[in-house]
């Protein structure tokens, strides 16, 4: 699941890695757009072994990762879900 | 406000069963990211983690117990469940009840409960 | 499993004295590692998280160092509600592990 949240709270992430984290070991991702009480983009992920790590927006595993998932978001196929909460 | 109440047995004998509950308020182990877990003190000595559970029953456990622990929760209850099987002088510790919520920054056991004092002697 | 090699095991000290705890990985945890702090007959308590970082409501006189795999706390200046165990926790693999503790008394 991808989710895109709008909040009103500090930065989340303390520390960002840029390893590389296969798809497969990934249940949620969560992007955290720049503004609202944090001066950067924050991608926060979910994997399955019960981790969470936040991870460097400029790394290119994860910037060729949300291309991926936006584009088959706008496909037909079955999609992972996009969740913008405004407060 | 979180809290965390561990129940259990004060004393038992060797080979027995030791069963624990622990029943918290203060949050639900139902939302995406919750867990519980059981960490246990010998008397002046250090922590040991155990087990924990999160919200989808993804259970986890410390390999050295691995054969004789078992996590379990009641979701609508708010409780979660500790089993050790065939116990020895060797587990006699407090054991405590904690909580982890996988939220950025995260803390795991970021809520304690007051710990239950467990003795095994024949 | 990760060991974590806590020292001292004990010690005593005076109240304005700088203290310092340490901490030693068996392999990269990449700060993923707390400092609890446990008084007499209580709870144990998160005070730094992420290897630097202070949880709420932790003095300032508390902070947290990583120096490769040695991951130490410092209080700066010792007061005497700080007389407590301390204990270390890596939860960058299961299982998590924790050092043997640091019994810190009043000299």
């Known amino acids: 699941v991808l989710e895109v949240y709008y909040t009103s709270l500090r930065c989340r992430c303390v520390q960002e890695s840029s390893v590389f984290i296969p798809r497969r070991f990934i249940d949620r991702i969560q992007i955290l757009p720049r503004g609202n009480g944090c001066p950067r983009k924050e991608i926060i992920v979910w994997k399955k072994n019960k981790s969470i790590v936040c991870v460097d927006p400029q790394a290119e595993w994860i910037q060729r990762m949300m291309e991926v998932l936006r584009k088959r978001s706008s496909s037909t196929l079955p999609v992972p879900v996009f969740k913008r909460k405004i407060p | 406000q979180v809290t965390l109440k561990e129940s259990g047995p004060e004393i038992l004998q060797p080979s027995q069963t030791l069963s624990l509950t622990c029943t918290f308020s203060g949050f639900s182990l139902s939302p995406y990211g919750m867990g519980v877990g059981w960490i246990r003190q010998p008397s002046g000595k250090g922590l040991e983690w155990l087990a924990n559970i999160w919200w989808d029953d993804d259970k986890y456990y410390n390999p050295s117990l691995i054969n004789r622990l078992t996590i379990s929760k009641d979701t609508s209850n708010n409780q979660a469940f500790l089993k050790i099987t065939n116990v020895d002088t060797t587990d006699s510790a407090t054991y405590y009840c904690v909580r982890s919520e996988l939220v950025m920054p995260y803390v795991p056991f970021d809520y304690w409960g007051q710990g239950v004092m467990v003795t095994v002697s024949s | 499993d990760i060991q974590m090699t806590q020292s001292p095991s004990s010690m005593s000290a005076s109240l304005g004295d700088r203290v310092t705890i340490t901490c030693q990985a068996s392999?990269?945890?990449?700060?993923?590692l707390v400092w609890f702090q446990q008084k007499p007959g209580r709870s144990p308590r998160p005070l730094i998280y992420y290897a630097t970082n202070l949880a709420n409501g932790v003095p300032s006189r508390f902070s947290g160092r990583r120096s490769e795999s040695d991951y130490s706390l410092t209080i700066s200046s010792l007061e005497s509600e700080d007389m407590a165990d301390y204990h270390c926790l890596q939860f960058k693999q299961y299982p998590y592990t924790f050092g043997a503790g640091t019994k810190l008394e009043l000299k």
């Open positions: 392999q990269d945890i990449e700060n993923d």
